[in-house]
Every structure is written in structure tokens, then in C-alpha cells.
């Protein structure tokens, strides 16, 4: 009685259960009553990452330097190449097919999370007591200067974009 379903890592063809090819190998010929499935290793620039019956291996991803990409992890016969972005750039999408420059946080905003090769800068508004007067991809909101610790008084209140201005205390005679 020919099978209608096959075990894990097998496939059904011509009423036969044939072994799938292991990751890193492609199908050359299906099994028959007289022969096993024939598989061949993927070539240097190719891969297959699952048990499969593919007759062609997939081409490794190309990390195009013209798109700001570089190799983070070289592909093997079983894994694809992983690309990442050059310094100062991050992936435009999850598939990381091209890169864009990290954005800067404008004055009044500080860096909450510095950008990586795969994620953009995350900015946050400077809360009360903090400021940022620069457009930067690295600078966090800085605390206002504490005039008291310098034995000075606030002459001009700080904002989210400016520090407080300290001045000398008025001396009463």
C-alpha cells in the first residue's frame, strides 16, 4: 500500500517517501524504489537553510557598499550573509537592503538611544530641569546648572533648549 503521508524530513513523490536534503545541500534526484534521494552541497556563494527538495541553492545576499552596507556575518552553505550599515548609518527596513544616515536630535531633544547599524537614533524631549542646545546624534539632555552649589543665584531661567544663567547673589549691607 503506497504511503499518503511521510515522516519528518521526508517528502512524498511517485507514491514514495523520499528523504529531504539537509540544510546546505540541494536536490539532484528524487529517490526511487532502487536509489536514495541524491543531494549535492551548495557552492561557495550559495545556501539553503532548511531541510529541502530545492533543485537550486539561494544566492547569498550581497552587501552593497554603494548602499552603505557591509558584511556583519559571512554566509555559509546553511546561512545567508547578514548585512549591516556602515558607521553613522542604519538599515532602512528590516531586510536591510539599504542604509540611511542616523537622524540627529534637534535642540530641545536629547538622545534616548544611540543609533546602531540596524536602528535609528531615538530622541526624547528634554524634561524640566534638562536641556539640549545642539542638534546631535549622540548628546543626551543635560541637567541645568545648579547655581546654588556654586553659591550663585538664577538670573535667567532655563528652558528645554537653554541652560539657566547664574549670577552673583545681591549682598545686603
Amino acid at each position: 500500500e503506497p504511503p499518503t503521508a511521510c515522516r519528518e524530513k521526508q517528502y512524498l513523490i511517485n507514491s514514495q517517501c523520499c528523504s529531504l536534503c539537509q540544510p546546505g545541500q540541494k536536490l539532484v534526484s528524487d529517490c526511487t524504489e532502487f536509489t536514495e534521494t541524491e543531494c549535492l552541497p551548495c557552492s561557495e556563494s550559495e545556501f539553503l537553510d532548511t531541510w529541502n527538495r530545492e533543485t537550486r541553492c539561494h544566492q547569498h545576499k550581497y552587501c552593497d557598499p554603494n548602499l552603505g552596507l557591509r558584511v556583519q556575518q559571512k554566509g555559509t552553505s546553511e546561512t545567508d550573509t547578514i548585512c549591516t550599515c556602515e558607521e553613522g548609518l542604519h538599515c532602512m527596513s528590516e531586510s536591510c537592503e539599504s542604509c540611511v544616515p542616523h537622524r540627529s536630535c534637534l535642540p530641545g531633544f536629547g538622545v534616548k538611544q544611540i543609533a546602531t547599524g540596524v536602528s535609528d537614533t531615538i530622541c526624547e524631549p528634554c524634561p524640566v530641569g534638562f536641556f539640549s542646545n545642539v542638534s546631535s546624534a549622540f548628546e543626551k539632555c543635560r541637567p541645568w546648572t545648579s547655581c546654588e552649589t556654586k553659591d550663585l543665584v538664577v538670573q535667567q531661567a532655563g528652558t528645554n533648549k537653554t541652560d539657566v544663567v547664574c549670577g552673583p547673589q545681591d549682598r545686603q549691607r
Partner: antibody, heavy 112, light 112 residues
Framework: QVQLVQSGAEVKKPGASVKVSCKAS????????ITWVRQAPGQGLEWMGD????????KYNEKFKSRVTLTVDTSISTAYMELSRLRSEDTAVYYC?????WGQGTTVTVSS | DIVMTQSPLSLPVTPGEPASISCRSS???????????LEWYLQKPGQSPQLLIY???NRFSGVPDRFSGSGSGTDFTLKISRVEAEDVGVYYC?????????FGGGTKVEIK
């Protein structure tokens, strides 16, 4: 029905080459390996090699590897076995087979 | 290479009586996938070999059910439950689990 029809008998001189053909019909040639087997007069069967017509993949018996070449022409559903540098001991009937179906055999005589 | 040893070399039989042929391999012929490609062929006088049994126990289509195959590892047997006159010829076992594939030396079955 499945049929494997082989080329006719050959008489060759030592040192020459012979090319035996095997025409398949009644099935898709590219789905089964073609096996080549020979049988010297009054002797048993000897496996020479196999070829998969779909991929061109081959398996050879080391004993013949340097002298035998297996090929296929899928456009005419024909497999070939070429044996070079013939010697008298190569006198035999040469069979192509799908294992479940066999050709009628080709007699190759090597004689000076 | 795997050596396939058949016994007996010659088997005189009486029609209607059972017959048994043994085939021993020099090493285990279970392949890496867990399959055993052990086949039995009959070569009738003046004919090409014909497949009887494949993968140790499977009878090829059209083969009478008086033929059966059994065994595992290194020991295999072909049984004919009731021999008929048309069963005469040379029987060969063949292993295609490990390259180079090899035939047994043959067992000649003849009527007493």
C-alpha cells in the same frame, strides 16, 4: 511499456574504444538512474557505473573509472557507455538497466 | 568493496519442492538513511537478468508470489515455495547500498 533498446554487437581491436547506446522509452528518462552492468562469457554480473539522466550525476566502479564514460542525450532519450583502451578481458555482454527493466545486452568482442 | 557471497553455487531442485538461496555480505549493507538496497535477479538461459525482489522483501510487479525475500544486516535469503520448471536459471543477489555496488557470484538452479 518501459523498454531499453541497446545498439548492436561490436568487434573491436585492443586499444580501441567502444560506445554502446541504450534508448529508453515508455517512461521519463530523467526520473531513473541508468545502471551499466557487464557479463564476461560464462561469468557473473559486474556493476560498472550509474548515471542520473536528469542531473548528469554519476557513480563509477573504481575498477573502470579511468576507462569508462557514462553520458546521456535527453533530447533523444538515450544513454551511452564508452569504454576506452579495450583489452581482450573486456569481451563481454554489456547491459543497460533501470534495475526493474533491462536492455537486451550488447556483445562486445575485443580481438586482434 | 563489499563482497556478496552466495550459496549454494548450484541447486538441483524437484518441481513442486521448495528452494532456498543464501546471500551474505562482507559488511552490514544498511545505508546512512537506514535503507537496505538488496535485490534478487534471475537470469534465464540466453536472456537478460530480470528483477524479482527489491529492498530485501519487496516483490517486483508480475513476479509470482512463490518468490519471497528476507533478511537484514549481512544475511539475506531468497525462497521459492514451490519450484516450477520455468524458474531455472542463475539467481544473483545485488547490493546497491554502498558504492561500489556489487553482485553475488550467482546460484544456478536446475531441475533434477
Amino acid at each position: 511499456q518501459v523498454q531499453l533498446v541497446q545498439s548492436g554487437a561490436e568487434v573491436k581491436k585492443p586499444g580501441a574504444s567502444v560506445k554502446v547506446s541504450c534508448k529508453a522509452s515508455g517512461y521519463i528518462l530523467t526520473t531513473y538512474w541508468i545502471t551499466w552492468v557487464r557479463q564476461a562469457p560464462g561469468q557473473g554480473l559486474e556493476w560498472m557505473g550509474d548515471i542520473h539522466p536528469g542531473s548528469g550525476s554519476t557513480k563509477y566502479n573504481e575498477k573502470f573509472k579511468s576507462r569508462v564514460t557514462l553520458t546521456v542525450d535527453t533530447s533523444i532519450s538515450t544513454a551511452y557507455m564508452e569504454l576506452s583502451r579495450l583489452r581482450s578481458e573486456d569481451t563481454a555482454v554489456y547491459y543497460c538497466a533501470r534495475r526493474d527493466y533491462w536492455g537486451q545486452g550488447t556483445t562486445v568482442t575485443v580481438s586482434s | 568493496d563489499i563482497v556478496m557471497t552466495q550459496s549454494p553455487l548450484s541447486l538441483p531442485v524437484t518441481p513442486g519442492e521448495p528452494a532456498s538461496i543464501s546471500c551474505r555480505s562482507s559488511q552490514n549493507i544498511v545505508n546512512s538513511q537506514g535503507n537496505t538496497y538488496l535485490e534478487w535477479y534471475l537470469q534465464k538461459p540466453g536472456q537478460s537478468p530480470q528483477l524479482l525482489i527489491y529492498k530485501v522483501t519487496n516483490r517486483f510487479s508480475g513476479v509470482p508470489d512463490r518468490f519471497s525475500g528476507s533478511g537484514s544486516g549481512t544475511d539475506f535469503t531468497l525462497k521459492i515455495s514451490r519450484v516450477e520448471a520455468e524458474d531455472v536459471g542463475v539467481y544473483y543477489c545485488f547490493q546497491a547500498s554502498l558504492v561500489p555496488w556489487t553482485f553475488g557470484g550467482g546460484t544456478k538452479v536446475e531441475i533434477k
